[in-house]
Interface confidence: low
């Protein structure tokens, strides 16, 4: 997966004038429409419940660090996480609970209960997702917790667990 | 939560001379480039099928009037609705199912089963959602129905109930 | 529904002189933001674990053969399916699995148990997305494999199972 | 380094019960299931049950309902399984072993208790 | 349950020669894992979700299988590899093990 440094934010670049001089189509490529996304997979290990993710994923215009998507440029996001969980059935029924954090405030949560037939069953599969689409400024985070992190499929299907944004409009 | 109202159409802006004059960067900041988006909580109290939302939620672009987002700009519209439903389980299965409308028509739904062992138990959670890519024009209305909008969790997670749109590519 | 057909790719117009000569909109929109864009609902008779849609879709930018969409222009792509099943409950658990292939390869699944029961009971509904944020190359192929595809919904519910893309940022 | 320390050998009469311990260090013992298998010479392996000591939940064997009963103690980061009504055929060496996530997949193994029932 | 079949029993190899042994389940799971075993010691995990290998575990392993029949491989045998080898399903409960393959150096 290709990992992209940001450029320098256009709004440095002189448009007119300097190398791009008369060229429209520099001028155009360096116009302010700014681009930002990551889309990051969840880590092989986890042993809490606020998530970490591989930061060899798809970042750019984004940060990542201890377990936070970082925002760079401010602007309207979308948000989106989408997790695979594996459950042992025990003799009682479980509820999977994913919860997006902005600036660790519980913003959005997705919950659904398994095992609801009360009866210990082979593994039971659940998938959940959740999406936001909210303003972020400058070193806002974005973060993940999951309660039930153990039930989180990190060893079939490592790369079901993932935690993706993009910047739809930027605040120019 | 920002609600920003919608500027003028940059097809009435004098793209040369005017205010902009030789100015590429303003120029380009009122290019043929529109965004349109939406981002709407339920509300609390909801009593019948069709959906009321909270309209002091995110809106750019797009009108909210009596349970419809109201387009204002035609183009291609990525459309996505999420609900969190709570079901105290009769002794029977429960059918839930999410209706996405464009016009009043049912343009697309979501239905899982919950309390599938038919045993009443405690509660259950599950979680839906429902998307949609579309061309829509000028005042088209898009609305959510759900036949059991009783289960529709408004207490316990009163965020979690979303219908969002925005507008992927305009018609210019 | 529309069927779009791509227009020469903007990188062949030339954005100084010719027919835009030095009017900017008329350049502006001709500048380089490709979009690319699908929204295939899935075919009405399935017959094998890779699914078919109907080509009679939206399609902008993007060409449909044999049950693969393939791209035509470079870049990062946001990428969902969504599908309905309806499952007669055998007196076991089923799994049910939608798969999201890039040139063949599985790049993502989502999994989610039903009839967990194990009760041979009425009709049980399940809905099931997948998405994925990802560079694609020209001729990049994406598909969908389901094992279980006899259990799609494509009668009640023609309309809910589909398979949808869109570019977000181009490679130039 | 993620460690599991169980308790010496126990030599019992039969109709009494033994428990034994599972001391974790090394990682964040309350995130891990915790399993217990049995091996008798000639028998090979045979899961007796788990627990998730984060919350007490525990799985196990039918088989050995009844037989054995599993416990934690979060202070102490230490698990315990408890034998009853002890016969010969539960002679053998009880292994616990750390849980990697929910795949039942034991990672970690303690070097074994070795129970020995006799009268 | 389901029922782990392992074989062979017992066997042995040369060391630089191929060794496959096999794990044969009384019906389908999703994955296999496989522990290694050596006298007066715990087991160690060697292979997990059928053909992933445990930290430390030399190359020369390998896993495969699916559906009902599952195997392990060593490339080329050495010395060291000497011990009981054993498969565990994890697709349903309750949690069963193989009764393992002992593979001696010839």
């Known amino acids: 997966q290709r990992t992209d440094s940001i450029p320098n934010s256009p709004d440095n670049v002189p448009l007119k004038g300097g190398n791009c001089s008369e060229d429209l189509l520099c001028i155009l490529k360096r116009a302010p429409f700014k681009k930002s996304w990551a889309y990051l997979q969840v880590a092989k290990h986890l042993n809490k419940t606020k998530l970490s993710w591989n930061k060899d994923g798809i970042l750019h215009g984004v940060r990542y660090q201890d377990g936070n998507l970082v925002i760079q440029f401010p602007g309207l996001y979308f948000i989106i996480c989408q997790l695979q969980f594996l459950v042992q059935c025990p003799n009682n029924s479980v509820d999977l609970k994913l919860e997006l954090l902005i600036n660790k405030h519980i913003k959005k949560q997705a919950l659904v209960t398994v095992c609801e037939s009360g009866m210990q069953t082979k593994h039971v599969y659940q998938n959940l997702s959740q999406f936001l689409l909210d303003y972020l400024q400058v070193n806002t985070t974005i973060s993940v917790n999951v309660d039930t992190f153990q039930y989180i499929d990190t060893s079939t299907f490592p790369l079901e667990n993932v935690l993706s944004i993009f910047l739809y409009s930027n605040s120019d | 939560q920002r609600t920003d109202s919608i500027p003028n159409s940059p097809d009435n802006v004098p793209l040369k001379g005017g205010n902009c004059s030789e100015d590429l960067l303003c120029i380009l900041k009122r290019a043929p480039f529109k965004k349109s988006w939406a981002y709407l909580q339920v509300a609390k109290h909801l009593n019948k099928t069709k959906l009321s939302w909270n309209k002091d939620g995110i809106l750019h672009g797009v009108r909210y009037q009596d349970g419809n987002l109201v387009i204002q700009f035609p183009g291609l519209y990525f459309i996505i609705c999420q609900l969190q439903f709570l079901v105290q389980c009769p002794n029977n299965s429960v059918d839930l199912k999410l209706e996405l409308l464009i016009n009043k028509h049912i343009k697309k739904q979501a239905l899982v089963t919950v309390c599938e062992s038919g045993m009443q138990t405690k509660h259950v959670y599950q979680n839906l959602s429902q998307f949609l890519l579309d061309y829509l024009q000028v005042n088209t209305t898009i609305s959510v129905n759900v036949d059991t909008f009783q289960y529709i969790d408004t207490s316990t997670f009163p965020l979690e109930n979303v219908l969002s749109i925005f507008l992927y590519s305009n018609s210019d | 529904q529309r069927t779009d057909s791509i227009p020469n790719s903007p990188d062949n117009v030339p954005l100084k002189g010719g027919n835009c000569s030095e009017d900017l909109l008329c350049i502006l929109k001709r500048a380089p933001f490709k979009k690319s864009w699908a929204y295939l609902q899935v075919a009405k008779h399935l017959n094998k674990t890779k699914l078919s849609w109907n080509k009679d879709g939206i399609l902008h930018g993007v060409r449909y053969q044999d049950g693969n969409l393939v791209i035509q222009f470079p870049g990062l792509y946001f990428i969902i399916c969504q599908l309905q099943f309806l499952v007669q409950c055998p007196n076991n658990s089923v799994d049910l699995k939608l798969e999201l292939l890039i040139n063949k390869h599985i790049k993502k699944q989502a999994l989610v148990t039903v009839c967990e029961s194990g009760m041979q009971t009425k009709h049980v509904y399940q809905n099931l997305s997948q998405f994925l944020l990802d560079y694609l190359q020209v001729n990049t192929t994406i598909s969908v494999n389901v094992d279980t595809f006899q259990y799609i919904d494509t009668s009640t519910f023609p309309l809910e199972n589909v398979l949808s893309i869109f570019l977000y940022s181009n490679s130039d | 380094r993620v460690q599991l320390q169980q308790s010496g050998a126990e030599l019992v009469r039969p109709g009494t019960s033994v428990k034994i311990s599972c001391k974790a260090s090394?990682?964040?013992?309350?995130?891990?299931?915790l399993g217990w298998v049995k091996q008798r010479p000639g028998h090979g392996l045979e899961w007796i049950g788990d627990?998730?000591?984060?919350?007490?939940?525990?799985y196990s064997n039918e088989k050995f309902k009844g037989k054995a009963t599993l416990t934690a103690d979060e202070s102490s980061s230490t698990a315990y399984m408890q034998l009853s009504s002890l016969t010969s055929e539960d002679s053998a060496v009880y292994f616990c072993?750390?849980?990697?996530?929910?795949?039942?997949?034991?990672?970690?193994w303690g070097a074994g208790t070795t129970v020995t029932v006799s009268s | 349950q389901i029922v782990l079949t392992q074989s062979p029993a017992i066997m042995s190899a040369s060391p630089g020669e191929k060794v496959t042994m096999t794990c044969s389940a009384s019906?389908?799971?999703?994955?296999m894992h496989w522990f290694q075993q050596k006298p007066g010691t715990s087991p160690k995990l060697w292979i997990y979700?059928?053909?992933d290998l445990a930290s430390g575990v030399p190359a020369r392993f390998s896993g495969s299988g699916s559906g009902t029949s599952y195997s392990l491989t060593i490339s080329r045998m050495e010395a060291e590899d000497a011990a009981t080898y054993y498969c565990?399903?994890?697709?349903?409960?309750?949690?069963?093990f193989g009764a393992g393959t002992k593979l001696e150096l010839k």
């Open positions: 072993a750390r849980i990697y996530g929910n795949y039942w997949i034991f990672d970690v």
């Open positions: 090394g990682y964040a013992f309350t995130n891990y299931w």
């Open positions: 627990i998730y000591p984060g919350n007490y939940n525990s």
């Open positions: 019906s389908s799971v999703n994955y």
């Open positions: 979700s059928t053909s």
């Open positions: 565990q399903q994890r697709s349903s409960y309750p949690l069963t």
